[in-house]
Interface confidence: low
């Protein structure tokens, strides 16, 4: 009589997480009578996966009906595979007894699990930086298998080269994680820019996953200031304007000083947006030239996004003609006394 053989035809099987795996096993004889069991791993610590005779194995089913006469196929389906199911599976024939006696084992089938990486999450710097500075963006994706993975960075569609990537763990594992840090040099035009982290993996079938971050969250474009005066129709008044240009983000506090003394403070409200995403704003004062003292300096001081204030000063220019229009009795503050003292637009 030919000796019973337990045949596991595949040395290895690869399955995508969430799918079912089929592990094939046939025996060459139904004699002697006794159950077939499936284990993961070998030796005393092996894990019982399926017992034909008894037990409840909700994810494991036999491919063919093991109770059918002359059925020698003891292949199993394992449903809803996860990376934790990876390992070597053995089909083992037992001789019926009390207890059942192990008779013969198959050579084993290694189950490797292909698991999709999670959607990449891109995080930017905690504090904003100004143009010409370098900021770091981090991209993370988890839970993939096998370990081989490709990660690329793009800024506005252009591939970046300054980045470092690590895949963990270094050794064998059921699943892996990737972390990559890219360094991006900011420019004044980056308010509308975007960085993209792209992850390609065998499970994604050529359709990579992408994570994005907007540079608008990372950039601060400081304003440029310009102060100038214009005459008004009333001959004893001039308009002094502070033009605040090309700043981002919007948060801005403007203070007017007269010879170093605070005269009024405004928060930027009605802004105009530039094509590059930066903003412009202007604030103006009506100045009574008849109330001047010689050498009045008006200063426009701007605190942008909580940064140290920047300022621009302007010495009030009063023409001889304007001086002539003023009566000798005129006195009082330089700024027009009507409220509000200034205006913006």
């Amino acid at each position: 009589e030919e000796e019973l053989q337990v045949i596991q035809p595949e040395k290895s099987v690869s399955v995508t997480a969430g799918e079912s795996a089929t592990l094939n096993c046939t025996v060459t004889s139904l004699i002697p009578v006794g159950p077939i069991q499936w284990f993961r791993g070998a030796g005393p610590g092996r894990e019982l996966i399926y017992n034909l005779k008894e037990g409840h194995f909700p994810r494991v089913t036999t491919v063919l009906d093991p109770t059918k006469r002359n059925n020698m196929d003891f292949s199993i389906h394992i449903s809803n595979i996860t990376p934790a199911d990876a390992g070597t599976y053995y089909c083992v024939k037992f001789r019926k007894g009390s207890p059942d006696v192990e008779l013969k084992s198959g050579a084993g089938t290694e189950l490797s699990v292909r698991a999709k990486p999670s959607a990449p999450v891109v995080s930017g710097p905690t504090a904003r930086a100004t143009p010409e500075h370098t900021v770091s963006f981090t991209c993370e994706s988890h839970g993939f298998s096998p370990r081989d993975i490709t990660l690329k960075w793009f800024k506005n569609g252009n591939e970046l080269s300054d980045f470092q990537t690590n895949v963990d763990p270094a050794g064998k594992s059921v699943s892996y994680s990737i972390r990559s840090t890219a360094r991006v040099v900011l420019t004044r035009r980056d308010v509308h820019s975007q960085v993209i982290c792209e992850v390609a993996h065998v499970t994604l079938q050529g359709d990579p996953l992408r994570g994005t971050a907007n540079l608008s969250e990372a950039i601060r474009v400081p304003p440029t200031l310009e102060v100038f005066q214009r005459p008004m129709r009333a001959e004893n008044q001039v308009n002094v304007t502070c033009q605040v240009r090309k700043f981002y983000p919007q948060r801005l506090l403007l203070t007017w000083l007269e010879n170093g003394n605070v005269s009024q403070t405004e928060t930027a409200s009605t802004l105009t947006e530039n094509k590059d995403g930066t903003y412009n704003w202007r604030s103006w004062l009506l100045v009574n030239t008849c109330a001047h003292r010689d050498g009045v300096v008006l200063t426009c001081q701007v605190e942008h996004d909580g940064q140290p204030a920047v300022s621009k000063s302007h010495a009030l220019e009063v023409s001889a003609h304007q001086k002539e229009q003023c009566s000798d009795t005129t006195s009082g503050p330089v700024l027009a006394p009507t409220a509000p003292l200034g205006g913006s637009g």
Epitope: T61, T62, L64, D65
Partner: antibody, heavy 118, light 107 residues
Amino acid sequence: EVQLVESGGGLVQPGGSLRLSCAASGFTLSSYDMHWVRQATGKGLEWVSAIGTAGDTYYTGSVKGRFTISRENAKNSLYLQMNSLRASDTAVYYCVRGGVWDDAFDIWGQGTMVTVSS
Amino acid sequence: DIQMTQSPSSLSASVGDRVTITCRASQDINNYLAWFQQKPGKAPKSLIYTASSLHSGVPSKFSGSGSGTDFTLTISSLQPEDFATYYCQQYVSYPYTFGQGTKLEIK
């Protein structure tokens, strides 16, 4: 969508023949054990025949030698050739899919009526 | 052949009731027992396999138990759509055999 659609039923005289067909869609028929089950009007269910994935065939005693179950993989179809028909074969015939692992019935067709009468 | 006997043959119950149908096999069939529901003029619908496992899409108000020769189907809270005929079936060996059916009617 997984579906079974039977056809080929009708009125036939005793001793006559009829061939029932079952068209499968949404799955590969050859990967499953397939069955025919019948039900006479007002009566219970009766298993008639089965074909295994290896082509092995099984029949209930009353139809052995008269009925033949077969399948055509290219057409993803199951057949029941019924010869020497008797009045007692009058019933609605259902095509049924056996579960992939333990042959538990999971998918049923809508049935086709076979009437054997003179 | 393995004989399958269902009891009762018919049963009257009200909406909201909990009902139990039993099925006995003439010999040990392990847990290779299925339950089906059939409404007039319709094909049977698979409810339970291997004595206690619910087919996909079957509401959890249906439950099955048993092993060997004695099995039960329980419907925890009857709804109008549950009034139908129920069949048990053994599929441990050919020829597969069905119980004679239990007709569940509205009281």
